[in-house]
Interface confidence: low
């Protein structure tokens, strides 16, 4: 019977000939008098074969991620009958692997988004790599994942590639951010080769900023013929928040002679004051009202920022007409 | 470990002015909102004022309004309380807080110092 | 504001038996934003239950919080002597209150 072992080459062997190992019939006692053949897909090509002693020789270069593994056939003939000594056998050559593949993010690009002050711990993305070399051959293919740029914002986890927030942030102070994420395979020991992508994190909104008046004092005029649900003037507050979070209402907060009403103007975020009694002149010549400013739409969890309104002092000064 | 450690505290007559301080340590203080509450002798706690971890919001209680000023140094890892026209009751020990990260509770307190308001 | 109403104001037990102290606010306390401390004379607070049941790190688990609403509990299932102390409860729900205290002592 044929007596072999499991061949294997190593892949990317840089030789011009390197031994396979060796094809044998029990019967040959080893007096040159019998043949061996190769055939099949690779025969004579990628492989040949020593015909006297049946060494297997691979003569080219392999690469597994091409091509694992061949399947050939072999013959034992004698020589001085030229009929075969055993039965025709398949028998396989497999290609075994080295780490010659560097970790590939496949995805790219990578974009998250991510509401800005969400606690440590909240997962962004989870970023992946693959590596051709083969996943059963040692650590060839097992990845490490690890930060090269994103500290102290941002986490990786490093047999995961999820990404996680390790450090609060600002949207006020900063909107995006590029984190640099690196694939190690081998996990990481000596001769490991590696591949980066990067990710772009943007923040949302929230709203973690109250409306703040640009004034802490107004000055307004209004003409003591002026009729009631005239516009007397403007007032205007800022938020660093964006969209629906920067919306804001403003009201009285004191008025005791309840003479002004404000009103939102909801498309230019400002409060326009109106006269809600006729005001006289010999009467009273000059109003002070308080104003207060709170966002449209609060998030109870958020309520810890909004909750002392801003506030502004408006100094309304009747304007004289001369009656007949 | 976390550690917050008040100074400043002292005898000071009515009218008079304070700065109270808090070392922070063992955390990024930058990422925390930060608390002082008070405690009359024999009495119990009283919350007296927050600032946000970037130190852009601050609220009072309606006591201290207009008197306190809380602030905070984050290249110090300091937070600060001035306290100005000080009154009899105002007297208390003063702790500073740590508001703990996933909810307003507060997690760290200081050991406390007192303040002592009398002529 | 939201006052918070502690009671009773002293408890006196016996180390082994069970503690169950309340705290009623004035108001809804919302999604359950409440806090217990402890305080022991010369020393600062420390935080044993947030949102009214969840333990703070290192807590034994004696100790457990309930409630919603304006009712909440704290109960100390077995008093060992390290737990006679002062106990306060918080709201952080609008803005922040403390509850007057309880005090448990030794009977």
């Known amino acids: 019977g044929w007596v072999w072992n499991q061949f294997f080459v190593p892949e990317e062997m840089n030789t011009t000939s390197h031994h396979v190992g060796r094809l044998r019939s029990d019967l040959d006692n080893g007096n040159n008098s019998f043949q061996y053949k190769l055939l099949g897909a690779g025969a004579g090509s990628t492989f040949i074969i020593d015909e006297r002693t049946g060494d297997i020789y691979a003569i080219e270069k392999l690469d597994r991620e091409e091509r694992s593994l061949y399947i050939l056939r072999a013959q034992v003939i004698d020589i001085t009958t030229g009929r075969a000594v055993e039965p025709e056998s398949e028998f396989v050559i497999k290609v075994s692997d080295i780490n010659d593949n560097e970790p590939k993010f496949l995805d790219e690009p990578y974009e998250a988004i991510v509401p800005e002050m969400s606690p440590e711990g909240t997962l962004v993305i989870q970023v992946t790599a693959s590596d051709a070399d083969d996943p059963s051959s040692g650590n060839n293919a097992r990845l490490l994942y690890s930060l090269l740029q994103g500290q102290p914002y941002f986490s990786v986890e490093p047999t995961t590639g999820v990404i996680r927030i390790s450090s609060k942030m600002d949207r006020e102070l900063q909107d995006e951010y590029w984190v640099i994420i690196q694939a190690k395979d081998m996990i990481g020991q000596p001769g490991a080769l590696s591949g980066t992508t990067s990710v772009l994190i943007k923040l949302s909104d929230v709203n973690d900023n109250k409306p703040i008046f640009k004034e802490s004092l107004y000055r307004l005029t209004v003409s003591e013929s002026a009729p009631t649900g005239t516009s007397i003037g403007t007032i205007m507050a800022y938020d660093n928040d964006i969209g629906e979070n920067a919306e804001m209402d403003y009201s009285i907060e004191e008025d005791d002679s309840q003479t002004f009403d404000i009103i939102t103007n909801h498309e230019t975020q400002e409060g326009i004051v109106i006269l809600k009694k006729k005001v006289n002149f010999e009467h009273q010549n000059h109003y002070g009202i308080r104003a207060k400013v709170k966002n449209h739409h609060v998030d109870e969890q958020l309520m810890k920022y909004h909750t002392e309104a801003s506030t502004t002092f408006i100094k309304i000064q009747v304007e004289d007409v001369d009656e007949p | 470990q976390v550690q917050l450690v008040e100074s400043g505290g002292g005898v000071v007559q009515p009218g008079g002015s304070l700065r109270l301080s808090c070392a922070a340590s063992?955390?990024?203080?930058?990422?925390?909102?930060m608390h002082w509450v008070r405690q009359a002798p024999g009495k119990g706690l009283e919350w007296v004022a927050v600032?946000?971890?970037?130190?852009?919001?601050?609220y009072y209680a309606e006591s201290v309004k207009g008197r306190f000023t809380i602030s905070r140094d984050t290249s110090k890892n300091t937070l600060y309380l001035q306290m100005n026209s000080l009154r009899a009751e105002d007297t208390a020990v003063y702790y500073c807080?740590?508001?703990?990260?996933?909810?307003?509770?507060?997690?760290?307190w200081g050991q406390g110092t007192l303040v002592t308001v009398s002529s | 504001e939201i006052v918070l109403t502690q009671s009773p104001g002293t408890l006196s037990l016996s180390p082994g038996e069970r503690a169950t102290l309340s705290c009623r606010a004035s108001?809804?306390?919302?999604?359950?934003?409440l806090a217990w401390y402890q305080q022991k004379p010369g020393q600062a607070p420390r935080l044993l239950i947030y949102?009214?049941?969840s333990r703070a790190t290192g807590i034994p688990d004696r100790f457990s919080g309930s409630g919603s609403g304006t009712d909440f509990t704290l109960t100390i299932s077995s008093l060992e002597p390290e737990d006679f102390a002062v106990y306060y409860c918080?709201?952080?729900?609008?803005?922040?209150?403390f509850g007057q205290g309880t005090k448990v002592e030794i009977k």
């Open positions: 807080a740590r508001e703990r990260y996933f909810d307003w509770s507060f997690d760290y």
């Open positions: 063992g955390f990024t203080f930058s990422s925390y909102d």
């Open positions: 600032i946000s971890y970037e130190g852009t919001n601050e």
């Open positions: 108001q809804s306390v919302s999604n359950t934003y």
């Open positions: 949102g009214a049941s």
């Open positions: 918080q709201q952080y729900s609008n803005s922040w209150t």
